[in-house]
Each structure stands twice: as structure tokens, then as C-alpha cells.
């Protein structure tokens, strides 16, 4: 025998109280697949989470958090505050990045610059508290004598793709 | 560091008010929720209310609109008075900050009730 | 309101072993649980968020995991400074509640 209830689509719940009819889930519930015997509450979103996808009768709401805060965690369980670009969240509040050190975002940890001499580069442009260094050309390329212009691709012939 | 310290009168008598105060060293004070949270003695913790920078607040059914909260953004401080104690009042009472779950706690004031 | 209730009430358990701590929720919650620790004489100190997401500072041998209603927190190892009393508590819906907690002591 089939179970009626799995007649009951997502939005519904069965309801034992009224011979195993689908009811729709009440107001702040929702039920996101067929066949459920009861329907799950809403998540509600206050304090520092604020709503990013109100709640349906088929799917749950979802939160996001306040402006100048950002999500950490399954679902966003929890609101971390933001910083500037050039900064990085302490226990003492949004700090500045040590010198040769830069964060690009309004959250995460100051990063060490790169290291161009370990890829055998120059420095093409300074690294600032906001962004990093750009690496250039090796010095050797930069030496006396040394074309900096890149030699043309030799022309391929028609019909074939690069390799 | 971010650092909730909290004081108030610590001994009342049934229907007085209890008032508390809570101050927030280091950190960032707005666009947070700070709360109240108090815990009978011996027993397990009960959420009381919350308020942010701007003054709003929500608080708990059971406490039966006795809860008034307060902030000072230019001190940095938070306030709770609960009006009409009796002596099921009596518990230690926290202040926390609220991120979702409260992640920073103030080191708790005992209050007692008794006539 | 959303109840949430711990068991066991006390967990005896030896330096080193290992202790596992439950938490229910009377209806879903999705994972938003949080696990805290708390001594005599201090605030409670946040473990957990998310069901399953450490908190800064928070050792490894602490680890959260479940949804829906179920949750447990684990300790791997105890060691002399766990031994406390824990609390789950739900952050889904408002009011805001707590489990009744869980003593964890020495056997």
C-alpha cells in the first residue's frame, strides 16, 4: 500500500489531525520536499543578520549579515565586522598592516608581499598596504644591452592549433 | 582586546528595579547587538534581551515587558533595568556581544533578591 | 520558543579519554548551534558556532557536528582544564535559548 502522505508536494505537510490530507505549512514554516509529516519554522534573521532570501513555503529563509559586517561559517552562523582594504581585524579592532604586508579585501589577514627575487624577477611596482607587489622582468633582462621588447611568435601555419 | 565590563547594584528588595550597566573596551561598539544574559544560581542561562548602537532592541516573552534597555554610543555603554523583582530575579546577570552567538562575555554581577 | 535539551546532565570521564556531549533541538535549526564552556566563577566562553565551526583560539581536540535537531560536541582527548560544565544554545529563532547543560567531571 502506498503511504499517502507521499502524495503531499513541498509546501504542504500531511495532516494526521484531518485523515492525512495535505495541509499547507502555516504561516513562517516551509517544507522543501514531498511527503512530510510536519513543517520546519522559518529561520529568522535579527541582530546582526539581516535577510538575504525571505522564507516560502518551499524553501527557508537565508541571512546575510548587516552592512560593514560579512558571513563566517555554514549558512552564515556568524557576522565578523569588516575592515578597510589595508587592514586586518585584530581583538583590538581593525588594524593597519604591518609594513610588507598588504590585504586586498574588507576581510581575511595581512599577507606578506611576494618575494620577486625567489621567482628570479624585479620589482615592477611597490607593494602598498592594499596591494601587492608586481613582479617584472629578471634583472639579467634588464641588463645593459638587453632587449626588453619580446621577440614576435613565430607564425603559425593555418589550420593548426596551438599546442 | 575586546573587553565587556559591567557593575550595579548587587542586593534589592522584592519589587525594586534592578539596574545594570555594561561598558565595551576595545573593538568596535557600533553595528553590533549587545545582550543580557542571566543564570540563576546552580541553573543553566536565560537570554534576556539585546539592543544595538541605534537603540533597537527585542527581548524575551517571559520577562512580560519588565525589560527596558538603554545604550550610550558616546561611552560606549549599554544599560538593563528590570522593573517589579521578585525573588526568582535573583541570578548572576552577563553582558555579551551578540554575532550571531555571543562571542564576548562581561565577567558578571550577582544579584540578589531578598526582602 | 525553541527548546533545547542536553543529556546526559553529567558525564563522568577519564583524563585522556575521550567525551561526547548531546544536544536536541524541539525543531529544526538547521546548524545554527553554538556549544559554549563555562567554570565556576566565570562567563561562559564560546566554543562553537555554526554547529561545527571552532571559535578563534578554541583547541582542535574540541570538534561540533549534526543539523536539523541533533548535535554532539566532542572532545577528543580531556584534558584537566575541560572539565566544566557545557551548554548548546540556538541562534535560529528568537527568543533565544539554552540547553540545561552538560557537567563534564572527573570519574
Known amino acids: 500500500l502506498q503511504d499517502p502522505c507521499s502524495n503531499c508536494p513541498a509546501g504542504t505537510f500531511c495532516d494526521n489531525n484531518r485523515n492525512q490530507i495535505c495541509s499547507p505549512c502555516p504561516p513562517n514554516s516551509f517544507s522543501s520536499a514531498g511527503g512530510q509529516r510536519t513543517c520546519d519554522i522559518c529561520r529568522q534573521c535579527k541582530g546582526v543578520f539581516r535577510t538575504r532570501k525571505e522564507c516560502s513555503s518551499t524553501s527557508n529563509a537565508e541571512c546575510d549579515c548587516t552592512p560593514g559586517f560579512h558571513c563566517l561559517g555554514a549558512g552564515c552562523s556568524m557576522c565578523e565586522q569588516d575592515c578597510k582594504q589595508g587592514q586586518e581585524l585584530t581583538k583590538k579592532g581593525c588594524k593597519d598592516c604591518c609594513f610588507g604586508t598588504f590585504n586586498d579585501q574588507k576581510r581575511g589577514i595581512c599577507r606578506p608581499w611576494t618575494n620577486c627575487s625567489l621567482d628570479g624577477k624585479s620589482v615592477l611596482v611597490n607593494g602598498t598596504k592594499e596591494r601587492d607587489v608586481v613582479c617584472g622582468p629578471s634583472p639579467a633582462d634588464l641588463s645593459p644591452g638587453a632587449s626588453s621588447v619580446t621577440p614576435p611568435a613565430p607564425a603559425r601555419e593555418p589550420g593548426h592549433s596551438p599546442q | 582586546q575586546v573587553q565587556l565590563q559591567q557593575w550595579g547594584a548587587g542586593l534589592l528588595k522584592p519589587s525594586e528595579t534592578l539596574s545594570l550597566t555594561c561598558a565595551v573596551y576595545?573593538?568596535?561598539?557600533?553595528?553590533?547587538?549587545w545582550s543580557w544574559i542571566r543564570q540563576p544560581p546552580g541553573k543553566g542561562l536565560e537570554w534576556i534581551g539585546e539592543?544595538?548602537?541605534?537603540?533597537?532592541?527585542d527581548s524575551n516573552p517571559s520577562l512580560k515587558g519588565r525589560v527596558t534597555f538603554s545604550v550610550d554610543t558616546s561611552k560606549n555603554q549599554f544599560s538593563l533595568k528590570l522593573n517589579s523583582v521578585t525573588a526568582a530575579d535573583t541570578a548572576v546577570y552577563y553582558c555579551?556581544?551578540?554575532?550571531?552567538?555571543?562571542?564576548?562575555w562581561g565577567q558578571g554581577t550577582l544579584v540578589t533578591v531578598s526582602s | 520558543e525553541i527548546v533545547m535539551t542536553q543529556s546526559p546532565a553529567t558525564l563522568s570521564v577519564s583524563p585522556g579519554e575521550r567525551a561526547t556531549l548531546s544536544c536536541r533541538a524541539s525543531?529544526?535549526?538547521?546548524?545554527?548551534l553554538a556549544w559554549y564552556q563555562q567554570k565556576p566563577g566565570q562567563a561562559p566562553r564560546l566554543l562553537i558556532y555554526?554547529?561545527?565551526t571552532r571559535a578563534t583560539g578554541i583547541p582542535a581536540r574540541f570538534s561540533g557536528s549534526g543539523s536539523g535537531t541533533e548535535f554532539t560536541l566532542t572532545i577528543s582527548s580531556l584534558q584537566s582544564e575541560d572539565f566544566a560544565v557545557y551548554y548548546c544554545?540556538?541562534?535560529?529563532?528568537?527568543?533565544?535559548?539554552f540547553g540545561g547543560g552538560t557537567k563534564v567531571e572527573i570519574k
Open positions: 555579551a556581544r551578540l554575532t550571531g552567538p555571543f562571542d564576548y
Open positions: 576595545g573593538g568596535s561598539f557600533s553595528g553590533y547587538y
Open positions: 539592543i544595538n548602537h541605534s537603540g533597537s532592541t
Open positions: 525543531q529544526s535549526i538547521s546548524s545554527i
Open positions: 555554526g554547529a561545527s
Open positions: 544554545q540556538q541562534y535560529y529563532n528568537w527568543p533565544l535559548t
